[in-house]
């Protein structure tokens, strides 16, 4: 769930890395209330995920490795 490009809450689903093309990180500030990882999916959706959850960290790590290889 997001509003004005801010994540307001986290998804309650687990996504597969095959579904994700990239991510951006949201840091809590005066505009956005929470830290979040915003996953960008192959369907053009943006999904707000909790950066503390293991499955989120795993995908971020996997995508970061891919980016570093390029």
């Amino acid at each position: 769930a997001s509003n004005f490009d801010c994540c307001l809450r986290y998804t309650d689903r687990i996504l597969h890395p095959k579904f994700i093309v990239g991510f951006t990180q949201q840091l809590a500030n005066e505009t956005c209330d929470i830290n979040a990882v915003i996953f960008h999916t192959k369907k053009g959706l943006s999904v707000c995920a909790n950066p503390k959850q293991t499955w989120v960290k795993l995908i971020v790590r996997r995508l970061s490795k891919k980016i570093n290889k390029m």
């Epitope: 996504l15 597969h16 095959k18 579904f19 959850q53 293991t54 499955w55 795993l58």
Partner: antibody, heavy 120, light 107 residues
Framework: QVQLVQSGAEVKKPGASVKVSCKAS????????MHWVRQAPGQGLEWMGV????????TYAQKFQGRVTMTVDTSTSTVYMELSSLRSEDTAVYYC?????????????WGQGTLVTVSS | DIQMTQSPSSLSASVGDRVTITCGAS??????LNWYQRKPGKAPKLLIY???NLADGVPSRFSGSGSGRDYTLTISSLQPEDFATYYC?????????FGQGTKLEIK
Amino acid sequence: QVQLVQSGAEVKKPGASVKVSCKASGYTFTNYWMHWVRQAPGQGLEWMGVIDPSDSYTTYAQKFQGRVTMTVDTSTSTVYMELSSLRSEDTAVYYCARGNYGVDYAMDYWGQGTLVTVSS
Amino acid sequence: DIQMTQSPSSLSASVGDRVTITCGASENIYGALNWYQRKPGKAPKLLIYGATNLADGVPSRFSGSGSGRDYTLTISSLQPEDFATYYCQNVLITPYTFGQGTKLEIK
């Protein structure tokens, strides 16, 4: 070797709750998810939900939301699945299964199953 | 939720036959699909992960193919121990829905 050992069969009355345990051994417990899947008589496999033992994160199938609770005890490498407000349709074999994100999020090892019978 | 539809729901075949089971997803699941075998009274067993990869210890007569919405499990030469029920499963996004199963029986 990897082993998932589940608790024994249960008979419950409608409206009661049941708590099934699944004790893991032979691998690093917190490195893999644990799923719960059930199979009712004459029916197919039904995914109920998953717990990540490393952070206790859970996500449940909508059908079971509010009735199922999955918990973990890392000190004993055991996962628990509690299902409340039981009805006759909950009569099934309940399986725990290790979720391995290294093999495409597949369930690569399964417990032996626990038969839960709901009957008045 | 993503729906998974298997066909046929049951199938009679003989030892040595080549058998194909299909699984269709209600939307593109990008190869995030696994296949399991279940025999009566036993726990399910992983056969294929990631649509095409053979799980450890699974005989090479089993193979998986497909992409997008359509996937196939093939047994190249049926053995007596292969008579069982087979399930596909979506793992793209929770809930991880299963197909309704295909029961493979001896002709």
